[in-house]
């Protein structure tokens, strides 16, 4: 058993049928010695008397808010949460496995640049009695500071019969140098509590590996005289790290017909313009990627050919 | 990317072209190592990230773009003890800092070159003959060093009398390649920045 926060405790249980559970001793936070009784949650049934209460915690029915009283007055509370260990592996019931980029990916994180700011998000089908708390650091043995905000509900989606809820959090490394070569990964830890169930999820990454630039901005077409060709031009996104000659991007320009089946023409360039053939009803899209470190491509910025 | 690429002319700055080749070569070598050594811990998540140039060179600090010198977090430890001649500087008037930067890059390359050559000698003794260093990568390191053209003491190749532990050598190869790729990215950024300025 360990303390999650004041008066909230997590009991770690080896989770299998008929498991013996864990013996827990609760102590009433009071100078009083006599006439103390204990109850669980809203029930008035007296579980025991005395300054300490010894319980065997086996299942969720044994968890909850234990309260010690004296003469009708509440003296203190202890909330017990359960953390299930199933065959040596901590349970992951609360969050959904996003399976991208690999199995058992519960937290996904992205950064728009090298400033040390990043966003993480996760999915759940649970709509109520749910709280999250996020901590982060650079490295784990001698951690350096990363400040995270509060997790907020950022999207709701309908997936088949189920509603899916997306939560996200923004974090900022306290003293980040965009040009630094990372040798210690960022660690992100999310505590999730659903009713009386506690779970924790972690992700470890280098900012360089989670970079996903915003799409190029000011995408424009300039028709070339007496030709089906157009000059496409664009600019670096505002959110990208500067100077751009140091933090350079490379671009992919795509000409896509109205039908998804039509052949896509693609050109790769390090410049912020390209000459392409504009077909009728086609659209031109441009996306960006770090020129020197191949992390994710940005989303496409698009304009119609007409 | 095996697709048409419109590449800018390296122009007056001969090192840019070499640094691009270097990044391509080390990335290819790392990919090959990951595939060949699939039963070894060779991914970014599994290895310890060690920098053999730590406390010996300070490329990131010495080569910091002017725009980032205002960032307190980037100014931890600026070294100022490098040699100041080099052919990449020939065509333009350069600052003392730029000379320090290029000389720091040269020292990095020299250290990695020695490590890789020592490692290759060990790998050639492996009866499994599982992996060797790409000669193209070693050649590209050499070409960039020649383009930088700094006079510097030659570092003798490390020789070891004891029987090599091939498992450890292959893991060390992965560690070195990951670190060298990160340094190659920095070098490419620096060359691109210097070329633009």
């Amino acid at each position: 058993i360990w303390e999650l926060k004041k008066d909230v405790y997590v009991v770690e249980l080896d989770w299998y049928p008929d498991a013996p559970g864990e013996m827990v001793v609760l102590t009433c936070d009071t100078p009083e010695e006599d006439g103390i009784t204990w109850t669980l949650d809203q029930s008035s049934e007296v579980l025991g008397s005395g300054k300490t209460l010894t319980i065997q915690v086996k299942e969720f029915g044994d968890a909850g808010q234990y309260t010690c009283h004296k003469g009708g007055e509440v003296l203190s509370h202890s909330l017990l949460l359960l953390h299930k260990k199933e065959d040596g592996i901590w349970s992951t019931d609360i969050l959904k496995d996003q399976k991208e980029p690999k199995n058992k990916t519960f937290l996904r994180c992205e950064a728009k640049n090298y400033s040390g700011r990043f966003t993480c998000w996760w999915l759940t089908t649970i709509s109520t009695d749910l709280t999250f708390s996020v901590k982060s650091s650079r490295g784990s043995s001698d951690p350096q500071g990363v400040t995270c905000g509060a997790a907020t509900l950022s999207a709701e989606r309908v997936r088949g019969d189920n509603k899916e809820y997306e939560y996200s959090v923004e974090c900022q490394e306290d003293s980040a140098c965009p040009a630094a070569e990372e040798s210690l990964p960022i660690e992100v830890m999310v505590d999730a509590v659903h009713k009386l169930k506690y779970e924790n999820y972690t992700s470890s990454f280098f900012i360089r590996d989670i970079i996903k630039p915003d799409p190029p901005k000011n995408l424009q077409l300039k028709p070339l005289k007496n030709s089906r060709q157009v000059e496409v031009s664009w600019e670096y996104p505002d959110t990208w790290s500067t100077p751009h000659s140091y933090f350079s991007l490379t671009f992919c320009v795509q000409v896509q017909g109205k039908s998804k089946r039509e052949k896509k023409d693609r050109v790769f360039t390090d410049k912020t313009s390209a000459t392409v053939i504009c077909r009728k009803n086609a659209s031109i899209s441009v996306r960006a990627q770090d020129r020197y470190y191949s992390s994710s491509w940005s989303e496409w910025a698009s304009v119609p050919c007409s | 990317r095996n697709l048409p690429v419109a590449t800018p002319d390296p122009g007056m700055f001969p090192c840019l072209h070499h640094s691009q080749n270097l990044l391509r070569a080390v990335s290819n070598m790392l990919q090959k190592a990951r595939q060949t050594l699939e039963f070894y811990p060779c991914t970014s998540e599994e290895i310890d990230h060690e920098d053999i140039t730590k406390d010996k060179t300070s490329t990131v600090e010495a080569c910091l773009p002017l725009e980032l010198t205002k960032n307190e977090s980037c100014l931890n430890s600026r070294e100022t003890s490098f040699i100041t001649n080099g052919s990449c500087l020939a065509s333009r008037k350069t600052s003392f800092m730029m000379a320090l930067c290029l000389s720091s890059i040269y020292e990095d390359l020299k250290m990695y070159q020695v490590e890789f050559k020592t490692m290759n000698a060990k790998l050639l003794m492996d009866p499994k003959r599982q992996i060797f260093l790409d000669q193209n990568m070693l050649a590209v390191i050499d070409e960039l060093m020649q383009a930088l053209n700094f006079n510097s003491e030659t570092v003798p190749q490390k020789s070891s009398l004891e029987e090599p532990d091939f498992y450890k050598t292959k893991i060390k190869l992965c560690i070195l390649l990951h670190a060298f790729r990160i340094r190659a990215v920095t070098i490419d950024r620096v060359m691109s920045y210097l070329n633009a300025s």
């Epitope: 299998y16 049928p17 040596g88 | -």
Partner: antibody
Framework: QVQLVQSGGGVVQPGRSLRLSCAAS????????MHWVRQAPGKGLEWVAF????????YYADSVKGRFTISRDNSKNTLYLQMKSLRAEDTAVYYC????????WGQGTMVTVSS | SYVLTQPPSVSGTPGQRVTISCSGG????????VKWYQQLPGTAPKLLIY???QRPSGVPDRFSGSKSGTSASLAITGVQAEDEADYYC????????????FGTGTKVTVLG
């Protein structure tokens, strides 16, 4: 004490269907994940499927994906395996078992797919 | 598609020490704990070892398990006639958890 009693096995022709049941008692069935494991005659153990405690997630071996469906009725304390498009290679003793560091197995039920 | 490899058979005389190996990789044994089962003819498997080296109550202490890196082993010190059975190791794999990953199985024969 924990008990898992299996039923539903038998002889069936290729292409036909069969539903296995596993009745649980002696524990809070709705709190635990459950597996199906099979063993072909004279062969080793092969995992077939898993279902979470609340039925929210199901996982299948590639060899049965799209043909077998694992389900549970927590109000009846029963686990099911619906087997469709049966093949000769599905012939085996099928076991249900609890998920956890200590596990409990059903007695096994024989499924024979033969024409 | 067994990824955990066991020797097909091992044998020993009563009182001898018998060991069974179970070889895997970084994504299975290297990442998860290992269990060992004993299966007597015509019966369901019985758990002998969980968590690499833990014995459930009721399992004789002549059975012991260990794990090192990407392989595990089961030792029977002072093998007895009633130990003649099939033995299976079991773990998980990073790519497929919670699918159970079983070893190929080992037939233990007690001679004499």
């Amino acid at each position: 004490q924990v008990q898992l009693v299996q039923s539903g096995g038998g002889v069936v022709q290729p292409g036909r269907s069969l539903r296995l049941s596993c009745a649980a008692s002696g524990f809070t069935f709705s709190s635990y994940g459950m597996h199906w494991v099979r063993q072909a005659p004279g062969k080793g153990l092969e995992w077939v499927a898993f279902i979470r405690y609340d039925g929210s997630n199901k996982y299948y071996a590639d060899s049965v994906k799209g043909r077998f469906t694992i389900s549970r009725d927590n109000s009846k304390n029963t686990l099911y395996l619906q087997m469709k498009s049966l093949r000769a290679e599905d012939t085996a003793v099928y076991y249900c078992k609890t998920h956890g560091s200590h596990d409990n197995w059903g007695q096994g039920t024989m499924v024979t797919v033969s024409s | 598609s067994y990824v955990l490899t066991q020797p097909p058979s091992v044998s020993g005389t009563p009182g001898q020490r018998v060991t069974i190996s179970c070889s895997g990789g970084r994504s299975n044994i290297g990442s998860y704990t290992v269990k060992w089962y004993q299966q007597l003819p015509g019966t369901a498997p019985k758990l002998l070892i969980y968590g690499n080296d833990q014995r459930p109550s009721g399992v004789p202490d002549r059975f012991s398990g260990s794990k090192s890196g990407t392989s595990a082993s089961l030792a029977i010190t002072g093998v007895q006639a009633e130990d003649e059975a099939d033995y299976y190791c079991q773990s998980y794999d990073r790519g497929t958890h919670p699918a159970l990953l079983f070893g190929t199985g080992t037939k233990v024969t007690v001679l004499g």
